[in-house]
């Protein structure tokens, strides 16, 4: 039978190394062992290349192309073939359809005056253009109620959150995820980093009365406080954004 | 040592065709494009043409298109130029020289960094 | 195609003086930051052509620091600095970035 492509290739770039394409088909296909996508840089003398397709479902195909660190006036030009019948071809922007990588190592810490530290690393070398592009989004829920959550966004440099213990509910179990953003680059969300809990252990302020209350900003430099003070809570709303590319 | 000799360069009627080797020595062939560049008497550098590294891709000026071919055999280390239907403004030194490293995803470039010594083709009746 | 025009045609310096050699081209050469496809070439009487300078100022392996390449997108300079009777030739300029390569019309430097 004919071979169709139902929703045609939507590519992203994490703007390092990687570009990765999407498509369905319009029946169940064996995407490695019947379609391969071609890509090639438009400039002169490049060669093409050949990326093999795997399934991420049964009628959608996803493929991975290793690529150069990215710049602006790349563009690469995109043949998905079905042996010798030319399916879709298009042309591709990395710069245009910027995908983070995921933000890595979350990690959650005790700090001074009833405050927890978010700490997770920014996945891209300094060298690279969105090093210091990066905006995040951590969300924080509670294990056991899925109505108590927040959403944070860390707009300031520097890959942290601190975190009132008194915003959360004593002896509760949380789970914290982050995920990376560049305005610059009108890019999409990354994917969520993997989830870290631990156990909020904060002795909420009733059970002070009549003792003396702690400060619970003391200790913490000028530069804590803005952090508090921009890690802004948000309503939370999810877009995405899917390109097409013809 | 990187090094480039050309042969082939002949006397040759206009119409006529002639064929132009390169045999390369001293660095990966396989890995670089390669260019072949003119130089007619008393005049500057032309350039002809160019192939990627696999030979898969292969450019040329207007003024040599549909007449002259540019090939390579990576297992012999040899770029070739095919030269049909000569005419007398064809008449030039022609030399290749190595070009772009072409295996990675965007071609390295070094400009032309080696060239050869040259070989003249004559076309006169 | 990218037009490249070089000035001056002829140029005649004394020994140990520095020369200065234009290159124009009609289409920007900047491909992205610091990669400007612009090269420069000398051909020596009776020789073939060397490569000096790639990416507007990247000079090639064993050629002297004397020679210098600056310029970015449309504009560029050749410097040869303390001049040698040997940096007699013709001197060109080409862009590597699309097809078809073109070249300069070629500087002629004379020493004096």
């Known amino acids: 039978g004919s071979v169709k492509v139902l929703h045609e290739p939507s590519c992203f770039s994490d703007y390092i190394s990687t570009s990765v394409c999407q498509w369905k088909m319009d029946h169940p296909t064996n995407c490695s062992a019947e379609l391969r996508l071609s890509y090639q840089l438009d400039f002169m003398g490049s060669e093409n290349h050949t990326c093999v397709p795997e399934n991420r479902e049964d009628s959608v195909c996803v493929c991975s192309m290793p690529i150069d660190d990215a710049v602006e006036a790349d563009v690469y030009q995109l043949d998905l073939w079905a042996g010798q019948q030319l399916l879709w071809s298009g042309s591709f922007q990395p710069s245009k359809h910027v995908k983070p990588r995921t933000p890595g190592n979350l990690t959650v810490h005790p700090n001074i005056s009833h405050t927890w530290l978010l700490m997770w690393t920014n996945p891209y070398p300094t060298e690279n253009h969105l090093h210091s592009e990066l905006t995040y989004m951590v969300n924080v829920s509670n294990d056991n109620d899925p109505e108590d959550f927040k959403v944070y966004n860390v707009t300031y440099m520097g890959p942290t959150l601190r975190l009132a213990a008194s915003t959360l509910k004593s002896g509760a179990s949380y789970s914290a995820r982050v995920r990376a953003w560049a305005q610059t680059y009108n890019s999409t969300w990354s994917d969520w980093s993997p989830s870290t809990t631990w156990l909020n252990y904060y002795e909420p302020w009733e059970q002070h009365l009549g003792k003396p209350i702690p400060n619970p900003l003391l200790g913490l430099d000028s530069t804590g406080l803005n952090d508090i003070f921009e890690a802004q809570k948000i309503e939370w709303h999810e877009h995405h954004h899917h390109h097409h590319h013809h | 040592e990187v090094q480039l000799v050309e042969s082939g360069g002949d006397l040759v009627k206009p119409g006529g065709s002639l064929r132009l080797s390169c045999v390369a020595s001293?660095?990966?062939?396989?890995?670089?494009?390669m260019t072949w560049v003119r130089q007619a008497p008393g005049k500057g550098l032309q350039w002809v043409s160019l192939?990627?590294?696999?030979?898969?891709?292969?450019y040329y000026a207007d003024a040599v298109k549909g007449r002259f071919t540019i090939s390579r055999d990576n297992a012999k280390n040899t770029l070739y130029l095919q030269m049909n239907s000569l005419r007398a403004e064809d008449t030039a030194v022609y030399y290749c020289?190595?070009?772009?490293?072409?295996?990675?995803?965007?071609?390295?470039?070094?400009?032309?960094?080696?060239w050869g010594q040259g070989t003249l083709v004559t076309v006169s009746s | 195609d990218i037009v490249m025009t070089q000035t001056p045609l002829s140029l005649s310096v004394s020994p140990g003086e520095t020369a200065s050699i234009s290159c124009r081209s009609s289409?920007?050469?900047?491909?992205?930051?610091?990669?400007?496809?612009l090269d420069w070439y000398l051909q020596k009487p009776g020789q073939s052509p060397q490569g000096l300078i790639y990416l507007g100022s990247k000079r090639l392996s064993g050629v002297p620091d004397r020679f210098s390449g600056s310029g970015s997108g449309t504009d560029f300079t050749l410097r040869i600095s303390r001049v040698e009777a040997n940096d007699t030739g013709v001197y060109y300029c080409?862009?590597?970035?699309?097809?078809?390569?073109?070249f300069g019309q070629g500087t002629k430097l004379e020493i004096k």
């Open positions: 289409q920007s050469l900047l491909y992205s930051i610091g990669y400007n496809y």
């Open positions: 192939i990627s590294g696999s030979g898969g891709k292969t």
């Open positions: 001293g660095f990966t062939f396989r890995d670089y494009a």
């Open positions: 080409m862009q590597g970035l699309q097809s078809p390569l073109t």
């Open positions: 020289a190595v070009d772009r490293l072409t295996k990675t995803i965007r071609p390295q470039y070094y400009g032309l960094w080696v």
